[in-house]
Interface confidence: medium
C-alpha cells in the first residue's frame, strides 16, 4: 500500500505531492491521467511528462491538482467534462480526495460532487446512465523541484464576481469553447 | 478578431532549408498552441506538430522529427517552422493553426512550397 | 498512431438529401473533429467534441459517434455544402487526419 498517500497528515497544511495517477478500472483501458498543454484531458498508457501531477491539500481532504508540466489546473465542468485551465478556479478545479482500504484513491469535485473519470469513449453529455466513481493509484514522480517556477502554486484569482464561475476558464479566456472569435 | 497571416510562397532548391512564418494577432498568443499541417496537391492533412509558446515545449509526429523545428517568438506573436534537407516530397502547402481544447480553430491561408532544381 | 478512415471517398447528392460520411478509428478515441475544406482555400472548423457545431455552421449539419465510429450527417443537402470534409483525432500523439470525404452536388 501507498503508505505516505494514505498518512491523514499529508492532507492539510499544503502538503504537495508529485505522482501519476493511475486508473485500471474496467471501464477504462490501463492509462495515467494526462493533462495536455491545450487544455484537453486524456490517458496515457504509460508515464508520460504531460501525466506528473503535482496534488496540493488545500485543506483536509481537499487537493488541487496541477500538470507538472504544462503548469494548467485540473477542473470539471458541471456537466462532469475534464479540462486543464491556466487558472485556478476553487469551484471547478478542487477535487475532494476518498482514500481506499486496498491503496487506490477516489476523486470528486469538491463543488459539485461528480466523480473523477477519464474521458470515455462517449461524450460526457452521451453516457447512457452515470458511472461509479474511478478509482486511480498514486504512484509516486519525482520530488518538486525547487525552486517552484512562479505563479503555479500562487495562480491569478478566480473571478468571484462571475456570472458563471463553473464555466470553461483558462485558455479559452472565460468562454466556453465555442471557437467563436 | 483572430488571424494567423502566414509567410509567401517558397521556391527552393533540393538540400536546401526553409523557414516559414506565421503571425498571430487578435488573441493571447502564449494561451495557445500553433500546429503546422502539411498539405500535398491532391491530398489530405497531415499534422506536422506543434509549439505551445507561454512554454516553448514542442511536440511532433514522428514522421517529421529532423525535418521540422518549430520555434516561436513571443516578442512578435510569430511562430516558425523551418524544414531541412528538402527534396521533391516536401512541395506542399503548408498550414499553422491555433489549437484550443483539441481543436484547430483558426487556421492561417496556407504557404505553398515548391522544391525544385 | 491511430488510423482514421473516412468513408466514401467520394459522393454526390442532390439538393435536400440526406447525406452521411462516416470516419472509422483503428483504435478508440474519446472525440472526433471535424473540418470542412474547399479547393483553393483552408479547411474550417465544422465540428468539435464529437457534436458541437463550430461558430457559423449551419443547423442542418450534426455528428455523432463514440469508441471507433463517428458520423457527420446533413439533414438536407445545399450546394454550398460541396466540399471536401475530414475528420480528426487527438487521443493519442500524433493527431491523425482521416483521408477526407469529397462530397459533390448532383
Known amino acids: 500500500h501507498p503508505i505516505p498517500d494514505s498518512s491523514p497528515l499529508l492532507q492539510f497544511g499544503g502538503q504537495v505531492r508529485q505522482r501519476y495517477l493511475y486508473t485500471d478500472d474496467a471501464q477504462q483501458t490501463e492509462a495515467h491521467l494526462e493533462i495536455r498543454e491545450d487544455g484537453t484531458v486524456g490517458g496515457a498508457a504509460d508515464q508520460s511528462p504531460e501525466s506528473l501531477l503535482q496534488l496540493k491539500a488545500l485543506k483536509p481532504g481537499v487537493i488541487q491538482i496541477l500538470g507538472v508540466k504544462t503548469s494548467r489546473f485540473l477542473c470539471q465542468r458541471p456537466d462532469g467534462a475534464l479540462y486543464g485551465s491556466l487558472h485556478f478556479d476553487p469551484e471547478a478545479c478542487s477535487f475532494r480526495e476518498l482514500l481506499l482500504e486496498d491503496g487506490y484513491n477516489v476523486y470528486q469535485s469538491e463543488a459539485h460532487g461528480l466523480p473523477l473519470h477519464l474521458p470515455g469513449n462517449k461524450s460526457p453529455h452521451r453516457d447512457p446512465a452515470p458511472r461509479g466513481p474511478a478509482r486511480f493509484l498514486p504512484l509516486p514522480g519525482l520530488p518538486p523541484a525547487l525552486p517552484e517556477p512562479p505563479g503555479i502554486l500562487a495562480p491569478q484569482p478566480p473571478d468571484v464576481g462571475s456570472s458563471d464561475p463553473l464555466s470553461m476558464v483558462g485558455p479559452s479566456q472565460g468562454r466556453s469553447p465555442s471557437y467563436a472569435s | 478578431q483572430v488571424q494567423l497571416q502566414q509567410s509567401g510562397a517558397e521556391l527552393a532548391r533540393p538540400g536546401a532549408s526553409v523557414k516559414l512564418s506565421c503571425k498571430a494577432s487578435?488573441?493571447?498568443?502564449?494561451?495557445?498552441?500553433i500546429s503546422w499541417v502539411k498539405q500535398r496537391t491532391g491530398q489530405g492533412l497531415e499534422w506536422i506538430g506543434e509549439i505551445y509558446p507561454r512554454s516553448d515545449n514542442t511536440y511532433y509526429n514522428e514522421k517529421f522529427k529532423g525535418k521540422a523545428t518549430l520555434t516561436a517568438d513571443k516578442s512578435s506573436s510569430t511562430a516558425y517552422m523551418e524544414l531541412r534537407s528538402l527534396t521533391s516530397e516536401d512541395s506542399a502547402v503548408y498550414f499553422c493553426?491555433?489549437?484550443?481544447?483539441?481543436?484547430?480553430?483558426?487556421w492561417g491561408q496556407g504557404t505553398t512550397l515548391t522544391v525544385s532544381s | 498512431q491511430i488510423v482514421l478512415t473516412q468513408s466514401p471517398a467520394l459522393m454526390s447528392a442532390s439538393p435536400g438529401e440526406r447525406v452521411t460520411m462516416t470516419c472509422s478509428a483503428g483504435?478508440?478515441?474519446?472525440?472526433m473533429y471535424w473540418y470542412q475544406q474547399k479547393p483553393r482555400s483552408s479547411p474550417k472548423p465544422w465540428i468539435y467534441l464529437t457534436s458541437n457545431l463550430a461558430s457559423g455552421v449551419p443547423a442542418r449539419f450534426s455528428g455523432s459517434g463514440s469508441g471507433t465510429s463517428y458520423s457527420l450527417t446533413i439533414s438536407s443537402m445545399e450546394a454550398e455544402d460541396a466540399a471536401t470534409y475530414y475528420c480528426q483525432q487527438w487521443s493519442s500523439n500524433p493527431r491523425t487526419f482521416g483521408g477526407g470525404t469529397k462530397l459533390e452536388i448532383k
Open positions: 483504435s478508440s478515441v474519446s472525440y
Open positions: 493553426t491555433r489549437s484550443d481544447y483539441g481543436f484547430f480553430d483558426y
Open positions: 487578435g488573441y493571447t498568443f502564449t494561451n495557445y498552441g
